[in-house]
């Protein structure tokens, strides 16, 4: 039975709540309020139903046997619940229109909704409250307004913001004023005088954060209240005058041709003015722009000083002007609260330079182009130049230098190294290009001692061809040993020039002598199928590394196709 | 040619915001500002505010402060208002309206007929 | 906020007969740097938008009839018709842009006699 009447209780309940909502004039939630209250200090706040919506206030509604309630939704929560007003010590309480938190705690983040009712009538709207915390120096998230103050112009005030009701006439708080995380005391030009802060000369570097700390107690405890407010020294109204055009003026005049692009510039100083609007525009034979059937373009830029006086740039452009437009009338306006002021831009067209200069012009282009071209083609033929150029009159290196090999390959002892190295750089250096090569694997006797025979191998070769990959790299190698000796020979005797060959990209690399010659040195990269080609860049790059030498080489194009063939199939 | 049109009527209940929107075609839409009219039945014109679809400058008339904002879309020409809290003598036909600065509202758009009831 | 009046509320007049519309603001809208006096008259038939007829006083825009001229200094201006026409018949609106708000008349009701 008693099941059944707790059932019926609900049901009844949730009818009466649902036809009460439907009859609920609801506000929505005020965004305008957007009420931030530090953590641990009282917070009062007004029922917005009376200030903004309704048009009586709460005593007429009380008086009118109107009904206030207050209830509220936690952050990220959709369920509205009651507010809880049998807290210890009061905590949180309602008083006539007020909703009083002694102090906020962090979790009292939420949407809070006042609702006034009776049996025939009700409104109700929301607005939300947000709970932040502070650190030692004041610094929070919390939405600071903006104090101005005009620089020298004499005493100028602040007050201690939002903290009327929150004690009685006949307590007085202790008021602590900060800037930013220091105490004001002994500051030349800024003193706290209670609730109020003195400016007695407002200067630029008096910009910054202020913090009253209000100290009062209230019923055997002590609450704080802390106001932070942003002061921006600004302009001076003494000083302010209505807005000067810089351009266009007097001295500049836009001449220009049919066809060029004509830019007018249109730069207006504006004197700071508070709640003033600064507005730069133009016009065209006294219209609109838009009225005017050219294709006409306005850009604006806009700079402050640090004192917030502005100055607007709008760019008339006209892409290509016609002997028409460099008739018409461009006036530039700007307007502040101080006045309204114009300035037109002279525009005219010039007169056609003379004949000869086309010629000149002409001459001087075609000068410009040939040695561009020139350029051009040094830069993409640049090898071929060399080499041509070392084939017809270029000295064999060879004759009489005492060496036995053209070139000593060295590289990392690896199945794919070793294949590049004995099939594809050999068969092209040795049988395309007639050089003779020294292979150590291939060229040394069995049973010799390898540094010995490595050294001896390297100061017979006119170039140490050095095969990068990151096998390459690893410690104590052979190949390792002969980068090394190679380099010392070339630093120090200077007889022997070491040639980087990148057959596979290396990361960083620890080892010290690679990293010089990589700074040092041009670093040939083998580009995969790209590179295998006998008459590309990477063998065109290679034979300018290499000795000059006049020996009769094999090049009919019947064997380079032959060569090139056999290259695709390593 | 240039031509302002506006979004379809709406009826709104007292308490609830309204977003009417106004997209501008035939001309450079950041060269000029963008008014609010309104005009309750029967009754005279009425402004509300500006918007300088350039700077993103806005001002508006004290009576809609705190209830009316102003916002614009540059990529498709539009602007927006949206009166919030509406109450039923809010219910007029809203106009949006261009000028080129200080020249007076030269194109107007068709109105949009906002209705408060409950 | 400047206040702007109209007189009369409305009239009547036969058609090719002038009409004279009065307005005046309760404050001078008159541009001393640049002489001229920011205020506009619109046409507003009914169920459609205002239409613009005039700018800084006297300016006609492009595509109004020569037969509307506005004129007036500082506080006190007029809209005439030189010549009434059928499809004169409006309600006719003088508006400040001197100072925002910027803020229009009650309005003028034109009729055919």
């Known amino acids: 039975m008693t099941l059944l009447w707790c059932v019926v209780s609900l049901y009844f309940y949730g009818i009466l709540q649902s036809d009460a909502s439907e009859r609920c004039d609801d506000w929505g939630l005020d965004t305008m309020r957007q009420i931030q209250v530090f953590e641990d200090e009282p917070a009062r706040i007004k029922c917005p139903l009376f200030e903004h919506f309704l048009k009586f206030n709460y005593s007429t509604a009380h008086s009118a046997g109107l009904t206030l309630i207050w209830y509220w939704t936690r952050q990220d929560r959709d369920l509205e619940e009651p507010i809880n007003f049998r807290l210890p010590e009061n905590r949180i309480s309602k008083e006539k229109d007020v909703l009083w938190f002694r102090p906020t705690l962090l979790n009292d983040t939420g949407n809070y909704t006042c609702m006034l009712r009776n049996t025939t009538y009700c409104s109700k709207v929301a607005f939300p409250l947000e709970v932040v915390q502070k650190d030692s120096c004041f610094n929070s998230p919390m939405k600071l307004p903006v104090h101005k103050l005009y620089i020298e112009y004499g005493i100028q005030r602040i007050t201690c913001p939002n903290v009327d009701g929150y004690f009685p006439s006949s307590v007085k708080p202790t008021i602590t004023w900060y800037m930013g995380c220091y105490k004001i005391q002994n500051f030349n030009n800024v003193i706290p005088e209670g609730m109020n802060l003195s400016f007695l000369i407002a200067l630029i570097s008096n910009n910054g954060n202020y913090t009253c700390v209000v100290t009062y107690p209230e019923n055997g405890r002590t609450f704080h209240l802390t106001r932070t407010l942003t002061v921006k020294v600004v302009g001076s109204p003494k000083n302010a005058v209505p807005p000067v055009i810089h351009s266009p003026n007097d001295h500049v005049v836009y001449e220009k041709e049919p066809g060029e692009e004509l830019l007018i510039p249109c730069t207006v100083y504006f004197s700071f003015l508070m709640d003033s609007r600064n507005e730069v525009w133009w016009t065209i034979d006294g219209k609109k722009p838009d009225d005017i059937t050219i294709d006409v373009t306005i850009n604006e830029s806009i700079s402050h000083s640090r004192t917030e006086d502005e100055t607007r740039t709008q760019i008339l452009s006209i892409k290509k002007v016609t002997s028409e437009d460099l008739k018409r009338s461009y006036v530039c306006h700007a307007r502040s609260a101080k006045g309204e002021v114009a300035k037109a831009a002279k525009v005219k067209q010039k007169v056609p330079a003379p004949r000869y200069t086309v010629e000149l012009a002409c001459g001087f282009g075609a000068t410009v182009l040939l040695v561009v071209i020139l350029i051009v083609v040094y830069h993409v033929y640049w090898l071929e130049m060399v080499l041509f150029y070392r084939a017809h009159f270029g000295t064999d290196e060879t004759i009489l230098d005492g060496k036995e090999y053209d070139i000593y390959v060295s590289y990392a002892r690896n199945a794919e190294e070793e294949e590049f190295v004995l099939l594809t750089l050999r068969g092209v250096l040795e049988n395309e290009f007639g050089y003779k090569l020294c292979i150590f694997d291939r060229d040394s006797l069995p049973g010799g001692i390898v540094t010995d025979e490595t050294l001896s191998f390297i100061q017979k070769s006119r170039r140490l061809l050095v095969v990068l990959s990151p096998n390459y790299v690893l410690q104590g190698t052979q190949a390792l040993l002969e980068l090394k000796a190679g380099l010392e020979n070339m630093a120090s005797r200077g007889n022997i020039n070491v040639i980087l060959v990148q057959y596979k990209a290396v990361k960083e690399t620890k080892v010290k002598e690679l990293k010089r010659a990589k700074t040092v040195l041009t670093v040939i990269k083998w580009k995969g199928e790209k590179s295998k080609y006998p008459q590309g860049r990477f063998w065109k790059q290679l034979q300018v590394a290499m000795p000059v030498k006049k020996s009769p080489r094999r090049s009919s194009s019947d064997e380079q196709g032959l060569s090139y063939s056999s290259l695709k199939n390593v | 040619q240039v031509q302002l049109f506006q979004s379809g009527a709406e009826v709104k209940k007292p308490g609830a915001s309204v977003k009417v929107s106004c997209k501008a075609s035939?001309?450079?839409?950041?060269?000029?500002?963008v008014h609010w009219v309104r005009q309750a039945p029967g009754q005279g014109l009425e402004w509300m505010g500006w918007?300088?679809?350039?700077?993103?400058?806005?001002d508006y008339a004290q009576k809609f402060q705190g209830r009316v904002t102003m916002t614009w879309d540059t990529s498709i020409s539009t602007a927006y208002m949206e009166l919030s809290r509406l109450r039923s003598d809010d219910t007029a036909v809203y106009y949006c309206a261009r000028s080129y600065y200080y020249y007076g509202m030269d194109v107007w758009g068709q109105g949009t007929t906002v209705t408060v009831s409950s | 906020d400047i206040v702007m009046t109209q007189s009369p509320d409305s009239l009547a007049v036969s058609l090719g007969e002038r009409a004279t519309i009065n307005c005046k603001s309760s404050?001078?809208?008159?541009?001393?740097?640049?002489?001229?006096?920011?205020l506009a008259w619109y046409q507003q038939k009914p169920g459609q938008p205002p239409k613009f007829l005039i700018y800084?006083?006297?300016t006609r825009e492009s595509g109004v009839p020569d037969r509307f001229s506005g004129s007036g200094s500082g506080t006190d201006f007029t809209l005439t018709i030189s010549s009434l026409q059928a499809e004169d018949v409006a309600v006719y609106y003088c508006q400040q842009y001197y100072i925002t708000p910027f803020t229009f008349g009650p309005g003028t009701k034109v009729d055919i006699k």
């Open positions: 404050q001078s809208v008159l541009y001393s740097s640049n002489n001229t006096s920011y």
């Open positions: 800084w006083t006297s």
């Open positions: 918007i300088n679809p350039n700077s993103g400058g806005t």
């Open positions: 035939g001309y450079t839409f950041t060269g000029y500002y």
